[in-house]
């Protein structure tokens, strides 16, 4: 039986949540993947998704969320930069595989963001001052906003999530489109 668990991460405002979703199977490499929030009494809401098919090493940015799919490693990297208290909540990663129901990629993450800068190496005190010049070309998010409750009953693999420093300067305004950005090196 599938063991559904949560991993709790307590971070400070301004820090970055860095999650790697291990999708294990090669057949999922080009599948569209999404990062979702689950609010009490609601269906999971999609916050960001990769393109369809999901491209290798091709960062997609939606506001403060960056998705990067690395087919060679079987990993989807999800980052939420410049965390705010209101980002606190329950998150999950899913794979879209229509016409089938989407399924989770790993244990859910319970994110708790508190005020105040921790001063730990993994954080970025000045992250709100970072500016990334967004390319003029954007594409609309071609993924469903909501997922059937059945999503949570199916699932492949695991994840880890940690504090990290943002790898590049990112515009932290609210952006609703999917934005293609250069690879972060």
């Amino acid at each position: 039986a599938t063991k559904l668990t949560e991993e709790k991460y307590e971070l400070k405002e301004g820090q970055t949540l860095d999650v790697k979703c291990d999708y294990t199977l090669e057949k999922f490499a080009s599948s569209q993947k999404a990062w979702q929030i689950i609010r009490d009494g609601e269906m999971p809401k999609t916050l960001a998704c990769t393109e369809r098919p999901s491209k290798n090493s091709h960062p997609v940015q939606v506001g403060r969320i960056i998705l990067e799919d690395y087919h060679d490693h079987g990993l989807l990297r999800v980052r939420m930069v410049n965390l705010q208290v209101e980002d606190s909540g329950l998150y999950q990663c899913v794979i879209y595989q229509p016409p089938k129901e989407p399924h989770m990629l790993f244990d859910r993450i319970r994110l708790v963001v508190t005020k105040g800068f921790s001063g730990t190496p993994g954080s970025n005190e000045n992250s709100t001052q970072n500016v990334y010049k967004i390319p003029p070309t954007t594409t609309k998010a071609l993924c469903p906003l909501y997922t059937s409750p059945r999503t949570v009953t199916q699932a492949p693999p695991k994840s880890t999530a940690d504090v990290s420093t943002p790898d590049s300067e990112i515009n932290l305004t609210n952006v609703t489109d999917i934005i293609r950005v250069p690879v972060f090196n």
Partner: antibody, heavy 117, light 111 residues
Framework: EVQLVESGGALVKPGGSLRLSCAAS????????IHWVRQAPGKGLEWIGR????????KYAPKVQGRFTISADTSKNTAYLQMNSLKTEDTAVYYC??????????WGQGTLVTVSS | EIVLTQSPATLSLSPGERATLSCRAS??????????MNWFQQKPGQAPRLLIY???NQGSGIPARFSGSGSGTDFTLTISSLEPEDFAVYFC?????????FGQGTKVEIK
Amino acid sequence: EVQLVESGGALVKPGGSLRLSCAASGFNIKNTYIHWVRQAPGKGLEWIGRIDPANGNTKYAPKVQGRFTISADTSKNTAYLQMNSLKTEDTAVYYCTGHYGSTMDYWGQGTLVTVSS
Amino acid sequence: EIVLTQSPATLSLSPGERATLSCRASESVDNYGISFMNWFQQKPGQAPRLLIYAASNQGSGIPARFSGSGSGTDFTLTISSLEPEDFAVYFCQQSKEVPWTFGQGTKVEIK
């Protein structure tokens, strides 16, 4: 071409320290995990631990927790294994590996660590 | 930790024969609908090579004669027809939970 090259293996006395390096090429270590595995002479394989170089998160086997430390320098695309308080039973070939399919792929050639007085 | 037990310790076979290697876990390595069991091949003086991941998926460039099966606690690696280069030591490994663990290995030798 994906390649991992370990270095730093040596003969060291019990109680001593050693740092092994794992230089990666053909991929960016920030986008994966790097694992360390060892193999004592004529014995089986033993997973030591792994690092997520993007954020420094590490996990270790209980046997080495506290004595061994895995780190990474993403600017050099290199991972490290710092080994302290070495014991004779730490004598082994040490491998670093990349990650794929919830397991380990892309293995280095290994580097020999001998702990002896 | 999850303990993996491989059998037999040694398998003596001739080229062209079928090899069946077993790996038993002390507890289930299944989760999320996937079996987190992997198989590696190692030849003397060489690093291990990933053969099978997630119980039944072939690693990159692995010949079709290698196949994996099983779920829960019991897993099998099958080599349908042994080639001379297949005589080596084979290890199973679980990645369901930390610490990741290996079996003690099965040596496939020429009869």
